[in-house]
Every structure is written in structure tokens, then in C-alpha cells.
């Protein structure tokens, strides 16, 4: 399955929008910094077959979409930017979903790397618990926004590597 060129453009647009969503200076939130232990090995395109990598990407985008679809998120961000960001993520999900469905339909496709899916899920669990612990404070959201920018950058790089493999 080849992801459309519009997919990587959408990824870049999502990153730009997330960058624009920042409301407070990151420097005022230095005391709130947290290591969420991003599962970097899951973004190593060499580790997986393409079908597995796409499943991991889908999980990453889906969890990001869910995180920014909560009521707490709506209260934290400027509404029009948040809606545009969510729309970009939704489009990416559709692209990835079509690819995963296509791969599922292909016989002999290796089983999904379940530990990679779990690693992504656990990463977002750590982010969710951090927000709860910090009572969804503006600084907590700023730290999370910066972290998601990081993870989306990893996703973009993985997609580039997948395209080079084709």
C-alpha cells in the first residue's frame, strides 16, 4: 500500500498547527518537564515489515487524535486551531486505515507486532496519567503539546523511511 503524497503533507500541516497551538512560553513551564519515554524503537522503520510499521503509525495517530478530542483538551486550546489539527489527524487516520485494511486482506501478511502496539499505548497512558496528576494545568498541556510534536516528528520520519523502502 502506498500512502498518498497528501498524507505526508497532512502530517507536516498537523505539526505546523500543533506548533501554532502553543499559548504560553515553554520557558515558563520548565519545572513541569517530564520524560514520557517515547518508544523510539517503534519508529525504527528497519525493525518492521511495512504492514507492521503502518499499524504502529495508525495507533500513534489514533491515540493522538483521542487525546486531543477530550473535553479537557477543548478547554485548553484555541478552538479553530484544535479543529483544524483534529481534521488533519482524521485524514491521516483514514489514509493509514485504508492501508492497514489492504494489508489485512493480503494473505501471508505477518501478524501485527503486538508489543509495538502495546508500547505506543503505554506511552499515551503515561501522558494521560501526567495530565490527570497535574490536573490538566496549562503548563501540563504545554509539556504534552511539545511531546506530541516530538512524536509526530518521529512518525513523519518513519513514513519517509517507508516511502524510501518502496
Amino acid at each position: 500500500c502506498d500512502l498518498p503524497q497528501t498524507h505526508s503533507l497532512g502530517n507536516r500541516r498537523a505539526l505546523i498547527l500543533l506548533g501554532q497551538m502553543g499559548r504560553i512560553s515553554p520557558f515558563s513551564c520548565l519545572k513541569d518537564r517530564h520524560d514520557f519515554r517515547i518508544p523510539q524503537e517503534e519508529f525504527d522503520g528497519n525493525q518492521f515489515q511495512k504492514a507492521q510499521a503502518i499499524s504502529v503509525l495508525h495507533e500513534m495517530i489514533q491515540q493522538t487524535f483521542n487525546l486531543f478530542s477530550t473535553e479537557d483538551s477543548s478547554a485548553a486550546w484555541e478552538q479553530s486551531l484544535l479543529e483544524k489539527f483534529s481534521t488533519e489527524l482524521y485524514q491521516q487516520l483514514n489514509d493509514l486505515e485504508a492501508c492497514v485494511i489492504q494489508e489485512v486482506g493480503v494473505e501471508e501478511t505477518p501478524l501485527m507486532n503486538e508489543d509495538s502496539i502495546l508500547a505506543v499505548r503505554k506511552y499515551f497512558q503515561r501522558i494521560t496519567l501526567y495530565l490527570i496528576e497535574r490536573k490538566y494545568s496549562p503548563c501540563a498541556w504545554e509539556v504534552v503539546r511539545a511531546e506530541i510534536m516530538r512524536s509526530l516528528s518521529f512518525s513523519t520520519n518513519l513514513q519517509k523511511r517507508l516511502r524510501r523502502k518502496d
Epitope: S55, H58, E59, Q62, Q63, F65, N66, S69, L93, L96, E97, V100, I101, V104, M112, E114, D115, L118, R121, K122, F124, Q125, R126, T128, L129, I132
Partner: antibody, heavy 119, light 108 residues
């Protein structure tokens, strides 16, 4: 509000298959993995596997691999769990439970479906 | 597979008393992925505590959770009549996800 409504009780003969459904409402169906958990009479809870309704990929517990098939129908927001080669030990209440994160993990359950396997 | 062993299997106490339920894991479980559920006869399980010590929505403050590594505890500070049920610990730290065999809390 989130609701998971399961199909009714079933009685099956050993060797047969059963297909249990779980209809979701009150949230975006494709956003959350759906899990299946079973409970034999007077026994504890046992995780069987999960399905991502968005693309249909599944993760099964090794114990059920080859005998269980989880599918979904996005048009009706319904997931299905089919168990084949039934034996008496499969007599249990089968639950669907929605995934999520933090306080949303298994926060929503179906009402359960009793499957009785008897000759 | 991470085996969760709950003790005691049955706990007989009176309303007003303190209940301490244990869950021991066969190998280390990150506290973020250890949950507790309550189940009453004929009902589906109900989420009580998530990530070892956080109270789920609508759960009274008499319930609390603690622990780390391989030993986790659910405590009910002062039992109410509606607390008599079966309690399960659950982990999703690694596949396959597992539950303890349950502790039945019954009225003495």
C-alpha cells in the same frame, strides 16, 4: 453516554461455533479497541483478545489463537466474537469491554452473553 | 504470562470494618497498568481503581489502592453493605492481559 449491548444467550453443542455480538453507541466506534473477556460459572475473568474497529486488526491471547475470530461492522458499530470447536469448558459469560487510557480502560462493559455448551 | 494471585480467596468481615485485599504478581508490573474491578452477582465488572492508586469516577473515597512491583493492595477503610462483592486485580503491562482469580468479600 457510552453503551455496549450484547446479543442474547446461546446454547450450543460440543464442536459447534458461536458468534456473539456487541453493539456500541455513545462514542466514536472506530476510535477505541474493543476487548473480549469471559467468565466461566463461579470462576474469574479471562482476557481473550481485542480488535481495532477502525481497521479490523486483532490481537488474540495465545490460548484462543486458531479458535477465536473477532470482526467488526463499522456501518452498525458492532463487533463480533466467534469461537469455534466449542467444548464444555467454554461454557461462560462472554463480555465485551471498551479499551481506552487511564480511567477509561475497561470502564465500559457489555451486559454479558451466556454461552452454554452441552450435548 | 503474568500470573496475578489474590489473597485471601474469601474475606469475611462486618460492615464498618476495614478490608485489605492483596494481589501478588508473578513478575513485576508497572503500577500504571495495574487496575482493580468490583463485580456483583449477575453484573458486569465495574472499574474501581486505575493505575494502582487512582479512584475511578464515582467511586467513594473509602476505597484506596497502593503497591508497586509485584505486590499491590486494595483497601476499603470502612465497609458499607454495598461493598460485599468479588474484587479482581488486572494488569495490562504485557500480553496476554490477565486478571487475578478474585477475592470474595462476604458479610460475617
Amino acid at each position: 453516554q457510552v453503551q455496549l449491548v450484547q446479543s442474547g444467550a446461546e446454547v450450543k453443542k460440543p464442536g459447534a461455533s458461536v458468534k456473539v455480538s456487541c453493539k456500541a453507541s455513545g462514542y466514536t466506534f472506530t476510535n477505541y479497541w474493543m476487548h473480549w473477556v469471559r467468565q466461566a460459572p463461579g470462576q474469574g475473568l479471562e482476557w481473550m483478545g481485542e480488535i481495532n474497529p477502525s481497521h479490523g486488526r486483532t490481537i488474540y491471547a495465545q490460548k484462543f489463537q486458531g479458535r477465536v475470530t473477532m470482526t467488526r461492522d463499522t456501518s452498525t458499530s458492532t463487533v463480533y466474537m466467534e469461537l469455534s470447536s466449542l467444548r464444555s469448558e467454554d461454557t461462560a459469560v462472554y463480555y465485551c469491554a471498551r479499551g481506552g487510557l487511564g480511567p477509561a480502560w475497561f470502564a465500559y462493559w457489555g451486559q454479558g452473553t451466556l454461552v452454554t455448551v452441552s450435548s | 504470562e503474568i500470573v496475578l494471585t489474590q489473597s485471601p480467596a474469601t474475606l469475611s468481615l462486618s460492615p464498618g470494618e476495614r478490608a485489605t485485599l492483596s494481589c501478588s504478581a508473578g513478575s513485576s508490573v508497572d503500577s500504571s497498568y495495574l487496575y482493580w474491578y468490583q463485580q456483583k452477582p449477575g453484573q458486569a465488572p465495574r472499574l474501581l481503581i486505575y493505575s494502582t492508586s487512582n479512584l475511578a469516577s464515582g467511586i467513594p473515597a473509602r476505597f484506596s489502592g497502593s503497591g508497586s512491583g509485584t505486590d499491590f493492595t486494595l483497601t476499603i477503610s470502612s465497609l458499607e453493605p454495598e461493598d460485599f462483592a468479588v474484587y479482581y486485580c488486572h494488569q495490562w503491562s504485557s500480553y496476554p492481559f490477565t486478571f487475578g482469580q478474585g477475592t470474595k468479600l462476604e458479610i460475617k
